[in-house]
Structures are given as structure tokens and as C-alpha cells.
Amino acid sequence: AGVFELQIHSFGPGPGPGAPRSPCSARLPCRLFFRVCLKPGLSEEAAESPCALGAALSARGPVYTEQPGAPAPDLPLPDGLLQVPFRDAWPGTFSFIIETWREELGDQIGGPAWSLLARVAGRRRLAAGGPWARDIQRAGAWELRFSYRARCEPPAVGTACTRLCRPRSAPSRCGPGLRPCAPLEDECEAPLVCRAGCSPEHGFCEQPGECRCLEGWTGPLCTVPVSTSSCLSPRGPSSATTGCLVPGPGPCDGNPCANGGSCSETPRSFECTCPRGFYGLRCEVSGVTCADGPCFNGGLCVGGADPDSAYICHCPPGFQGSNCEKRVDRCSLQPCRNGGLCLDLGHALRCRCRAGFAGPRCEHDLDDCAGRACANGGTCVEGGGAHRCSCALGFGGRDCRERADPCAARPCAHGGRCYAHFSGLVCACAPGYMGARCEFPVHPDGASALPAAPPGLRPGDPQRYL
């Protein structure tokens, strides 16, 4: 267990031309707040998962009113750190999203209004217990400067916060099999604390709070012997009463979702669907009203003027969840039209279009034959988002603008000589061959391999190919 800490140093216009207009004005004073979302791993997959490592919302910053005519300065920031507690091991590699939100304090009907000013994202490697890491990220014309670190909560130590330390029981040495806890040499590594009730004989753990079973034992606490007989249950062959094989504990066992949240298993762990008024990885954050800005990703908050009344987030297309915190699996919607290939890069959606289609979502059919002229008597043939010209004899190229060299492909066989002709090509055949392309040998007795030669044509005469 531990805490990820984020310190925002500044948010203001980035270097270079095109400084952004101040987000606040005398008519519309405003204040900033920040949201951080953490996800484990560096994979593309992780980039669009929910904030599985946790999320945090900062306090509101001081109210700011733009001075008329002045360029947007660095804007006043909220006090303090953003802290994202993590219960399990620190993954070492993680993805982050930091959103800068503006709360407008003008005379809005129905309370203040929120809008997303900037969103930055990145993927980083970070060992727990290390020093503060500094970062600068740009979003459009804005620049965000910040530092972050991950630190373990005692008694956990180590780069992943998985080793546990306890003060030494004896001044000279640690217990059998336990090493000193560098850099805290006055402490000793403590044995892992497994899930409460985990069988000491048949269970073990590699992570705190875990209970893994030795062969032959099963159940959430490894107290059920595995039977060789087969039996069926909704989750496979399992039954605690008959001693059949039961799967290890599922991530939703014991429902980790607080406050009436419902748990659903995901390939990596679990996801809580929270009732209104609660959010967070385990629905542990409560007492939220619209004044807290609970709707993420541009969601519109309705109702909930006081802590006892619920709010509703109306999510923009592409987002879902009670707080609009979950992005729709965008590629599952098959957004790339006309057979395009979808790539969800996390920060953006990309479509790789089939030939003949273009646009961000392959929505632009490159119009086949519309407005497309084939020169020199060619005709346009449509097909699958592409067009081609079927050219008249003697012409070639994409638009039939090139004069074709009919002899370029060496069409005359057996050493025949090719001559370009206004209506095509002519082959002058070598002795012993005949045919339009000199493809037929003349038999030694003078008879050709053809059933009959065209009248008036001697073997060896030039043949015109029409």
C-alpha cells in the first residue's frame, strides 16, 4: 500500500506564439482545479481502462479575475498535493491523465459551470520510494509543470511497496529468514500478511492480503480439499459442500465495492458501478454534489444542490459511468467506416483506411468516378471506393493521358519483331512461326498448328493485332 503524490507547480501559457486567452474575465471570474487519473502499466490497453490505480480531485484554487489587456499569466493554483492512495503493489509503470478544470463563478443559472481547459497524458516508469520526478506537459497553447512521486505507507517498503518492515525485536539481528530493510537498517523485513483467515497449512501469499492455495486445496481461504469427482456449478466444477474443485477467489468475491456499488469482473481485476452520490475505484468517495464537479470528461451535472440530494451526470457521447469517468471502448463501436482498421491510442482514435477512402473515420469516399474524366475516349469504372480508367486502344496511365507503347511488353513471341501501328501492334514473325503474336510454330511440312490459316495469309507474314 502507498500513496501517489502529485504537486502542480504552474499552469499557464506555453512558450511560443499564439498565447491562449485567459480563461477568466472580469465578467466571468473563475478558479481552477485539477483531476488526476492513474492506470497501471504502459500498454495501449491500459490507456483506456478506468482509473484502476485511483483518481483524485484537487481543492479549488483561488478565484482569479483577468486584468483587462493583460496576457494570460500562470494561473493561481489550489493548495496542497493531489494524493492517490493505492492499496496493492505499486506497478512501477503507470499511465496518467491530468485534467485542468475551470469553474466559472459568474451568475450562472443553477450554480457554477465547469469546463475542461486542458488534458495531458503520459506513460512513465517510477519506483516507489524514489525522489520527486519533475515533468512539463503541453496541451494546445497551455503548459502544465508538475512533480510526482510514489511513496509506500508503513509498514510497506520497496520499489513496489510489497515488502513489509517492522522495528527490530532484538538489537543485533532480524528473525530467521528475514533480512534487514534497506535503507532502514534498524528495521527488519516482516513476513507477508496474507488474507485474514487464510489457512496457514494449505495457503500462502506473495502479495499482502492474498491467499493462494497449495495443490489439493481450494476455496477463498484454502480450507476446502479438492475432490477428484466432477460436479457442475455456475462458475465451473465447484462446490464447497461436496468438496469439488472451486476456482480461486474471484476479484469480486466479498464485493470490494462500498456504498452499494455493484462489482463486475474485468480481465485484470474488477470494476465498480457506483450508485449516484458515490464514486472512486471502490465507490468510497461520498457526499458529492454538483458543486464538487463530479462529472468528468465534459459531463453535465444536474441536481444535487445539497449533499443529501443526488446528482446526475449526463455524459457526452463516448463516455459512460455514473460520473462519465469511463470511456466507451471506442473501437468496439467500429467507428472506422468503409472497412477501415481502428486503433485506439488512448489519447486519440486513429483509423487506417482502405484504399479509396479517407478522413479521420474513413468517412470520405474518394468519390469514384464523380467529376473524374478519363482522357482520349477512356471510360471510368467504379469499384470499392476507388476508380480506374479503362483506356481506349493506344492509351494508358491512370487517366488515359499517356500514349501507350504497345510494344513495351514485348508481345511478339519466338523472336518476332514488334511494330507500333495506329490501331495496335504488328508482329513480324521469325521464320518458322506464325500467328498474331507469332505464338504458333509452322510444321515442317508447311501445315500450321492452327486448324486453318486465314485465307491469303502465308506463314511468316506480319500479323496485325487488333
Epitope: 469546463s115 457526452p316 457521447p317 467506416r337 468503409n338 482514435l349 479521420p360 473515420r361 468517412e363
Partner: antibody, heavy 121, light 107 residues
């Protein structure tokens, strides 16, 4: 609250020009593509033009291609439609409408109240 | 261009009636079909996107279905505020095209 407010409509002679504006508020303008859609008197809706969030992708209906130009100024939260060589058949109420967040659906999820363009001699 | 054909062009119904409007595309548009409602003198409003997804704030009596070329908008129990003109729009291939509209009038 998402708001789009069109302006710049009016009466113009055939062959003349007009510039429509659309002022946006209540959302992060630079995150969304915007459409212009028009409606001739007593008729249905006709899509006119589209510009993506960053202004890199621009599309026009064939009926206006070469005569109309769509543009945007994200710093001013504003969208524009420059209309040249106007014809009688361009007479309509012109609406600006916000596209969806990722251009996944090509919806028009919020609309302005419209501005009327009349082309007549 | 993809032609969108709506039927009927108008219909009369009473409050509480179940109303169905159909929209046919001239070629496959998968599920990229959106429905809008427009009242006289007002701007259109998005009701349903991606064939069946309700836009925020739209009552659940509105529903959509279909795929490919044939789509349906259903109002399960018509309310007084539902008397309006409804348009379908395809978002699959440029240019974006609308159906001709279906006017729902009071019987």
C-alpha cells in the same frame, strides 16, 4: 450549459457575399468538430459543411463547394462560414451544430437557434 | 451520395399512442444513424445517436433500432410535447445526409 449563437444573416443579392459567425460557450470548443446545417423555408435539413476540432479536416456539401469557406478560431471560441457567389437556392436558416467528442458518430448534438440568409434581387 | 428515405412523411396520432417512424438508407450505413426532433421555429435537437443510444436528457419513451439500411424510431407512448417533425441522418459516409422528415401531428 452548451450554447451556440449564430449571427451575420441577412438579405443579400444573388452573387453577393455574407459571413456567418457562431459563438460557442459552455464547453471546451477546441475539443469538438462543428457543422453548418441549413434549412430552406418549408423544407428539410441539409448539411452544408464541417470543420474538425483542430481545423485540420474540412468537408463541404457539393452544392456549396468552391463558394463557401468554413473556418474557426479556437482562441475566440468562434466558428465562421464565408459565403460567396450566393444564389437564390442558398436562402435558408443556417444553424451551427456541435459534433460529437471523438467524431465517432458524426452526430450534431447541440444546435444554435439559427440565422436567416435571404438571397433575392 | 447516400439517400435517406423516411416514411411516412406525416402521421396523425393521439397522446398515449405508440408511434413508429422508419428510415431507409440507399446503402449500408452499419449503425451510424442519428435521429433529431424539430419543433416549428426551433432548432433541431438530437434524440438518438448510433441507432439506439439515447442522448442525454431524452426521455426513455424514445427508442431506436435497426442496422445496415433499415432503421426505426419508436415513441412508446406519445406525449403532448412530442408533436414535432423527426429527421434521420446518416453519419457513415460523406456527405452527411438527412431524411426528408416525418411530421407527427395531433389526431
Amino acid at each position: 450549459e452548451v450554447q451556440l449563437v449564430e449571427s451575420g444573416g441577412g438579405l443579400v443579392q444573388p452573387g453577393g457575399s455574407l459571413r456567418l459567425s457562431c459563438a460557442a460557450s459552455g464547453f471546451t470548443f477546441s475539443d469538438y468538430g462543428i457543422h453548418w446545417v441549413r434549412q430552406a423555408p418549408g423544407k428539410g435539413l441539409e448539411w452544408v459543411a464541417y470543420i474538425s476540432s483542430g481545423g485540420y479536416t474540412i468537408y463541404y456539401a457539393d452544392t456549396v463547394k468552391g463558394r463557401f469557406t468554413i473556418s474557426r478560431d479556437n482562441a475566440k471560441n468562434s466558428l465562421y462560414l464565408q459565403m460567396n457567389s450566393l444564389r437564390a437556392e442558398d436562402t435558408a436558416v443556417y444553424y451551427c451544430a456541435r459534433g460529437d467528442y471523438d467524431d465517432i458518430f458524426y452526430t450534431m448534438d447541440y444546435w444554435g437557434q439559427g440565422t436567416t440568409v435571404t438571397v433575392s434581387s | 451520395d447516400i439517400q435517406m428515405t423516411q416514411s411516412p412523411s406525416s402521421l396523425s396520432a393521439s397522446v398515449g399512442d405508440r408511434v413508429t417512424i422508419t428510415c431507409r438508407a440507399s446503402r449500408d450505413i452499419t449503425k451510424f444513424l442519428n435521429w433529431y426532433q424539430q419543433k416549428p421555429g426551433k432548432a433541431p435537437k438530437l434524440l438518438i445517436y448510433y441507432t439506439s443510444r439515447l442522448h442525454s436528457g431524452v426521455p426513455s419513451r424514445f427508442s431506436g433500432s435497426g442496422s445496415g439500411t433499415d432503421f426505426t424510431l419508436t415513441i412508446s407512448s406519445l406525449q403532448p410535447e412530442d408533436f414535432a417533425t423527426y429527421y434521420c441522418q446518416q453519419g457513415n459516409t460523406l456527405p452527411w445526409t438527412f431524411g426528408g422528415g416525418t411530421k407527427v401531428e395531433i389526431k
